[in-house]
């Protein structure tokens, strides 16, 4: 039975040209995290694997940095980076947990962080 929950940074906004940290945290489970995939829509951004370390997908190498922790840092943000991001936790024995973050990249300097929220 899947008992865990994923806490994410929720709906967030950032300035064009700036950077942002995407964070997810899996709690309330003793499941072993085998791998975390970061995806934007259906595109693979990055992988963090317990045995093999980090991998940043070739098309994002220039603007994506691993960490902190299992999170992901997006740099040199453009308006095209606006959209949904998913952290997909592959765990044993529970299975797969998915967290969702919505990022809005703003032209002006009025970007503010949204509230944190949970996905069961």
């Amino acid at each position: 039975m899947m008992t865990g929950t994923i806490e994410t940074t929720g709906n967030i906004s950032a300035e064009k040209g700036g950077s942002i940290i995407l964070q997810c945290h899996l709690s309330s489970t003793t499941a072993q995290v085998t791998q975390v995939n970061w995806e934007q829509q259906d595109q693979l951004l990055a992988i963090c694997n317990a045995d093999l370390g980090w991998h940043i997908s070739p098309s994002f190498k220039d603007r994506v940095a691993p960490g902190p922790g299992l999170g992901l840092t997006l740099q040199s943000l453009t308006v095209n980076d606006t959209g949904e991001y998913f952290c997909i936790y592959h765990t044993y024995p529970d299975g797969t947990y998915t967290g969702r973050i919505f990022l809005e990249v703003l032209e002006s300097s009025v970007a503010e962080h949204g509230a944190r929220f949970q996905i069961p």
Partner: antibody, heavy 120, light 110 residues
């Protein structure tokens, strides 16, 4: 079409060397962990070696450790296996295989194999 | 000697259900995922089951995988003559840090 095509097999004398290649097509090669698996005549499958996405983490079966080296050239979409100090027991069909995006899940795509014969 | 243990052979008649077992230890099957492969004579292996119980697209639902403790099993229901092949289980071993295979099971359809 997703495809793996091995080459470089042949007849070699004991103590000799051989380099196998595996050309990948139809998928983003950089995003996948790769392995070599071999099968001696009339025998079962034996895993040989594994390499992560950019080649900075490699693992080997005890039977080939110190003699074989796995590597990859992502710019050429090619996986390699350098085999040195070859022995009669290395005679086998060598397959390259792609791991599932979560590499521990399994090997989802296999090449057709290339035959290595070690004999004097 | 393979790290994972499978029966050397199994058999069944058309339409029957056949189960192939795969036994490991606490550092592989018990805490990791299992995958199963079918190898028809003279061909490369083909993935049948990944993540212990999931089927890749194109694999008939006659094939199913399960796992309990240090053992896993592959079940084939509605056995057909074209299922005659060698079947292998495999898992990542956390202690050895290596990909371990079973010795293979030759399935004969009588």
């Amino acid at each position: 079409e997703v495809q793996l095509l091995e080459s470089g097999g042949g007849l070699v004398q004991p103590g000799g060397s051989l380099r196998l290649s595996c050309a990948a097509s139809g998928f983003t090669f950089d995003d996948y962990v790769m392995s070599w698996v071999r099968q001696a005549p009339g025998k079962g499958l034996e895993w040989v070696s594994l390499i992560n996405w950019n080649g900075d983490k490699t693992y080997y079966a005890d039977s080939v450790k110190g003699r074989f080296t796995i590597s990859r050239d992502n710019s050429k979409n090619t996986l390699y296996l350098q085999m040195n100090s070859l022995r009669a027991e290395d005679t086998a069909v060598y397959y390259c295989a792609r791991h599932w995006i979560v590499f521990q899940y399994g090997l989802d795509i296999w090449g057709q194999g290339t035959t290595v014969t070690v004999s004097s | 000697q393979s790290v994972l243990t499978q029966p050397l052979s199994a058999s069944g008649t058309p339409g029957q259900r056949v189960t192939i077992s795969c036994s490991g230890v606490s550092s592989n099957i018990e805490i990791k995922y299992v995958s199963w492969y079918q190898q028809l004579p003279g061909t490369a292996p083909k993935l049948l089951i990944y993540n212990s119980h999931q089927r890749p697209s194109g694999v008939p639902d006659r094939f199913s995988g399960s796992k309990s403790g240090t053992s896993a099993s592959l079940a084939i229901s509605g056995l057909q003559s074209e299922d005659e092949a060698d079947y292998y289980c495999t898992s990542w071993d956390d202690r050895l840090k290596s990909w371990v295979f079973g010795g293979g099971t030759k399935l004969t359809v009588l």
